[in-house]
């Protein structure tokens, strides 16, 4: 069942079917004998009770006040009264834009990230049984879609998808043709969730070591889920049996990003491990960033300024 009209302030476009549904509907059915009344007041005018005789455009059904269609002079305050229950709405009927397929003031804006799922479904549950056909327009040009009852777009968003999408439902009532338009302003934006991955610490690190001992080089980064972090060393990785890449550790940050850490373990350090670059790279769709480690014999550390050392 269609939910009730809970918003106290409503703006609608002239010339379209419209309805108000009060929010004690289930209760009203239980108390069939209770008097239920709809009133309108506009400006200085007192409450005027509404009934089908008030206007050929107005219809009353159970819990609903219908307009076929709503017009500019329907602007005003509406009341539903039943026993000690009252509901009030303020209705503002605005002019239709005659030069466009939609009225700018009646547009719902949506922001969709590029490559994220993007969906528009043309549905109108209240008038569903009366709708003959529905068309979907983009920037007022009709889109050719298979389903003319409920046209739908379901895809991964592209920048070209940006625009105004209007669902137009065509329906008959008492021999007259009406249409209801619902327009979405779709803005496609860059993937806001992605960050530029950052390698933590200095870009160049000299590590003081002793021959025959082991060392663990820790490479840490703040990155996106799909970003990769890896070590590069020597002519071809894996040529030195004393060098081992440990399993990457990942911890999710409160912001939904990842803190990754990858250790390169060098065992039984030899002369061949000294003064060569061990590069840690983080790669993302935005590119790469690299930080380098150089192993230096402890005896030689006096030759290098203290601030470049990593322990």
């Amino acid at each position: 069942a269609e939910s009730c009209t809970s918003r106290p302030h409503i703006t609608v476009v002239e010339g379209e079917p419209f309805y108000l549904k009060h929010c004690s509907c289930s209760l009203a059915h239980e108390i069939e004998t209770t008097t239920k009344s709809w009133y309108k007041s506009s400006g200085s005018q007192e409450h005027v009770e509404l009934n089908p005789r008030s206007s050929s455009r107005i219809a009353l059904h159970d819990c609903v006040l219908e307009f076929w269609p709503v017009e500019l002079n329907d602007t005003g305050s509406y009341f539903f009264q039943m026993k000690n229950y009252t509901q009030k709405w303020k209705l503002n009927v605005i002019r239709r834009n005659k030069h466009s397929c939609f009225t700018e003031r009646q547009v719902t804006s949506k922001i969709v990230e590029v490559k994220k799922f993007f969906q528009i479904t043309c549905e109108n549950s209240y008038y569903q049984t009366l709708v003959n056909s529905t068309s979907l327009y983009k920037n007022c040009k009709k889109l050719l879609l298979e389903n003319n009852k409920n046209p739908t777009i379901k895809k991964n968003a592209e920048f070209e998808d940006q625009g105004y999408y209007s669902c137009v439902h065509f329906l008959h009532h008492n021999g007259k043709l009406f249409n209801i338009t619902k327009t979405f302003n779709i803005t496609i934006v860059e993937d806001r969730s992605n960050i530029v991955p950052v390698l933590l610490g200095p870009k160049l690190n000299h590590v003081a070591v002793e021959l025959g001992k082991n060392v663990r080089l820790n490479c840490s980064a703040l990155l996106n889920e799909e970003d990769v972090i890896y070590w590069m060393f020597g002519e071809e990785n894996g040529s030195d049996p004393n060098i081992h890449e440990e399993k990457e550790m990942r911890i999710m940050t409160p912001e939904g990003k990842w803190h990754a850490s990858k250790v390169l373990r060098i065992e039984n350090i030899g002369e061949s491990n000294l003064n060569v670059l061990y590069n840690c790279t983080v790669a993302s769709t935005g590119g790469t960033d690299t930080k380098s480690f150089i192993l230096v014999r402890k005896a030689d550390m006096a030759d290098i300024p203290g601030h470049v050392f990593t322990r």
């Epitope: 860059e190 889920e225 799909e226 890896y230 990942r250 990754a260 935005g286 590119g287």
Partner: antibody, heavy 115, light 113 residues
Framework: QVQLVQSGAEVKKPGASVKVSCKAS????????ISWVRQAPGQGLEWMGW????????NYAQKHQGRVTMTTDTSTSTAYMELRSLRSDDTAVYYC????????WGRGTLVTVSS | DIVMTQSPDSLAVSLGERATINCKSS????????????LAWYQQKPGQPPKLLIY???TRESGVPDRFSGSGSGTDFTLTISSLQAEDVAVYYC?????????FGQGTKLEIK
């Protein structure tokens, strides 16, 4: 509109250099790396290298190391690929492409190396 | 470098029939830390730049018809066209973006039988 627009065809003599440009529009230029891919006549695709627009870092394929330079100008959202010491086997269509899976490509620039 | 090998080099399939192209990488392109597979498929028609069809091994690029699908993990991958259309005649390439240098397969030429 999201696009990569490349500079026009070039005819060069062996030993010369060529600089191909690739102007990006419709997206945030610094959010994606730019790769350069070439295709010799009737051949497959060859990745030459890429540049990280946000920090200027470059990765070149070993084959082109020392002969290729990739740069960007963020003020004009343009990427450049310069290839030096041209040889006849450098005759190819050179493409710029966005990201690490290449969801956006330039139309290509034909570079002909002939004496 | 990671070497990408496609098979077959060329393929002729009847209209409406299924076309299958294979791609093998010399080492894994599956990243255990996030369980993502760093493999893409492209379609290239004569005189045009390649067009991205599939990324992350199985995610269809927006606007690509659903007759195209990608599968596989680790080192063995497949591009399937469920019902071949005339406009699908092209050369198809796989590419890994797990490690630089990012490498392509040698290409598979798809024709109509």
């Amino acid at each position: 509109q999201v696009q990569l627009v490349q500079s026009g065809a070039e005819v060069k003599k062996p030993g010369a250099s060529v600089k191909v440009s690739c102007k990006a529009s419709g997206y945030t230029f610094t959010s994606y790396g730019i790769s350069w891919v070439r295709q010799a006549p009737g051949q497959g695709l060859e990745w030459m290298g890429w540049i990280s627009v946000y920090n200027g870092n470059t990765n070149y394929a070993q084959k082109h190391q020392g002969r290729v330079t990739m740069t960007t100008d963020t003020s004009t959202s343009t990427a450049y690929m310069e290839l030096r010491s041209l040889r006849s086997d450098d005759t190819a269509v050179y493409y710029c492409a966005r990201g690490w899976y290449f969801d956006l490509w330039g139309r290509g620039t034909l570079v002909t190396v002939s004496s | 470098d990671i070497v990408m090998t496609q098979s077959p080099d060329s393929l002729a399939v009847s209209l409406g029939e299924r076309a299958t192209i294979n791609c093998k990488s010399s080492q894994t392109v599956l990243y255990s830390s996030n369980n993502k597979t760093y493999l893409a498929w492209y379609q290239q028609k004569p005189g045009q730049p390649p067009k991205l069809l599939i990324y992350w091994a199985s995610t269809r690029e927006s606007g690509v018809p659903d007759r195209f699908s990608g599968s596989g993990s680790g080192t063995d991958f497949t591009l399937t066209i469920s019902s071949l259309q005339a406009e699908d005649v092209a050369v198809y390439y796989c590419q890994q973006y797990y490690r630089t240098p990012y490498t392509f397969g040698q290409g598979t030429k798809l024709e109509i039988k």
